[in-house]
């Protein structure tokens, strides 16, 4: 006869491991007992369990409540056992020693491999600002056994670097994603992808990029100079910019206070029916936590009864 077992049994942390040991004997042969022991190198055999044809299952105190026979129906030549709720410390070499009649004793060894699936974590880097050089966008760390694979999935252009730390029974892998921040990256997903044999599918953690920037400011509303004449209603100036975080707007008049009746509504400056008093230099001040920008325009309200043309001067300043 001969023993049938596996070279390696692989199980995920917390699952039950079946340790196979089947005696394929000739007819009339009987198995008296099967002794299971842990036999890691450099250490003596440690009892796991004893399956006896008459006495039944004996479990070592160290494994009490964790070792069982597979559910019925059971073949009397089957010496397999179930190790419940495998933990990392269970990883190692195991031996089954089968005593048969009349053929004598047989033994076989197997290795139990306990996969420890990673629990990845993603840590964003420092605040990203347009104009910075190569900057850490995020780091992703995953620890498991064996070492997990950590990669990045993104449309954003960048560079990655990885490092690994080996522990006694596991390995931690950290991957960093660096980029040169630009406003086009704002709102883009950066996904850490962790692969591991103990995972049914890759684990993914997504971080949305936030890049601080503030665009140049400009003022719209003076494109048609002829519209800015005395008596015109609904005249307005609109300040144009964009930024992250979204900017706030403030209007001032460079050559004095804002005329009465002029309404400030965020990025828009609304005028009452135009008079010559509304002529002047207006400044739009745009700011966010990252930066500030100014844009100024000169409004010259035209008196249609005068022949002189209206002068409009646009100046932009940062």
């Amino acid at each position: 006869g001969e023993l049938e077992t596996s070279d390696v049994v692989t199980v995920v942390l917390g699952q039950d491991a079946k340790l196979p040991c089947f005696y394929r004997g000739d007819s009339g042969e009987q198995v008296g007992q099967v002794a299971w022991a842990r036999v890691d190198a450099g250490e003596g055999a440690q009892e796991l369990a004893l399956l006896h044809s008459k006495y039944g299952l004996h479990v070592s105190p160290a494994y009490e409540g964790r070792v069982e026979q597979p559910p019925p129906p059971r073949n009397p030549l089957d010496g397999s056992v179930l190790l419940r709720n495998a933990v990392q410390a269970d990883e190692g070499e195991y031996e089954c020693r089968v005593s048969t009649f009349p053929a004598g004793s047989f033994q076989a060894r197997l290795r139990l491999r306990v996969l420890v699936p990673p629990l990845p974590s993603l840590n964003p880097g420092p605040a990203l600002e347009e104009g910075q050089g190569l900057t850490l966008a995020a780091s992703c760390t995953a620890e498991g056994s064996p070492a997990p694979s950590v990669t990045w999935d993104t449309e954003v252009k960048g560079t990655t670097s990885s490092r690994s730390f080996k522990h006694s029974r596991s390995a931690a892998v950290t991957s960093e994603f660096h980029l040169v921040p630009s406003r086009s990256m704002n709102g883009q997903p950066l996904t850490c992808v962790v692969s591991h044999p103990g995972l049914l599918q890759d684990q993914r953690i997504t971080h949305i990029l936030h890049v601080s920037f503030l665009a140049e400011a400009s003022v719209r509303g003076l494109e048609d100079q002829n519209l800015w004449h005395i008596g015109r209603e609904g005249a307005m100036l609109k300040c144009l910019s964009e930024g992250q975080p979204p900017p706030s707007y403030n209007w001032t008049r460079l050559d004095g206070p804002l005329p009465s009746g002029v309404r400030v509504d965020g990025d828009t400056l609304g005028f009452p029916p135009l008079t010559t008093e509304h002529s002047g230099i207006y400044v739009c001040h745009v700011s966010n936590e990252f930066s500030s920008r100014d844009s100024q325009v000169t409004v010259d309200v035209l008196d249609p009864q005068e022949d002189s043309g209206k002068q409009v001067d646009l100046v932009s300043a940062s």
Epitope: Q33, A35, A37, E47, L50, H52, K54, Y55, G56, L57, H58, S60, P61, R97
Partner: antibody, heavy 123, light 107 residues
């Protein structure tokens, strides 16, 4: 025929010592685990101590730990129990018994017993 | 230690009666249970091992059953030589422990 014959019992004062012997014959002594079991007058059976077949691994009941020592001489097919610091409650018939080691520290039932030797601890 | 609780502690029966003695372990012991018969002034004699296996030379009127924590010794038809004290013993763990005994007396 398997035979186990105990000797060495007798009357001893509290605090005294005795050495019990168990001579085995009719089987391969060195292949079996051996144990001592006692029975106080009118009482039940109490396991006292055990020893593995070929190693020096020994086991003791809490009630005798540190006072009794079990040993064996496989070349003489003899089991011993050295009893020190004897107390009145150690008064009993002491039996030796054999059991087959299945594996690790797991034994069969004790299938053969000696006739017993009486130990009386009294002043 | 595993406690073995035997019942009854004594019983009176007549020749030919069917006698049942029970033994309960404080935790599971698979079938690592033996039954012994002891007569006054004599050494215990093994009757049943592995909970239900009859020791060689023991009459077939003796039988054992059970596994785990609950066990039974049955004498199907009590004979005059069966009047004795019966003990159960677990040898699943060290120390092996005995029940307190059941004395079977003549009614």
């Amino acid at each position: 025929e398997v035979q186990l014959v105990e000797s060495g019992g007798g009357l001893v004062q509290p605090g005294g010592s005795l050495r019990l012997s168990c001579a085995a014959s009719g089987f391969s002594f060195g292949s079996y685990g051996m144990s001592w079991v006692r029975q106080a007058p009118g009482k039940g059976l109490e396991w006292v101590s055990g020893i593995k077949p070929s190693t020096s691994t020994t086991y003791y009941a809490d009630s005798v730990k540190g006072r009794f020592t079990i040993s064996r001489d496989n070349s003489k097919n003899t089991l011993y129990l050295q009893m020190n610091s004897l107390r009145a409650e150690d008064t009993a018939v002491y039996y030796c018994a054999r059991a087959e080691l299945l594996a690790f520290d797991v034994y069969t039932a004790s299938d053969y017993w000696g006739q017993g030797t009486l130990v009386t601890v009294s002043s | 230690d595993i406690q073995m609780t035997q019942s009854p502690s004594s019983l009176s029966a007549s020749v030919g009666d069917r006698v049942t003695i029970t033994c309960r372990a404080s935790q599971g012991i698979s079938s690592y249970l033996a039954w012994y018969q002891q007569k006054p002034g004599k050494a215990p004699k093994l009757l049943i091992y592995a909970a239900s296996s009859l020791q060689s030379g023991v009459p077939s009127r003796f039988s054992g059953s059970g596994s785990g924590t609950d066990f039974t010794l049955t004498i199907s038809s009590l004979q005059p030589e069966d009047f004795a004290t019966y003990y159960c013993q677990q040898h699943y763990t060290t120390p092996p422990t005995f029940g307190q005994g059941t004395k079977v007396e003549i009614k």
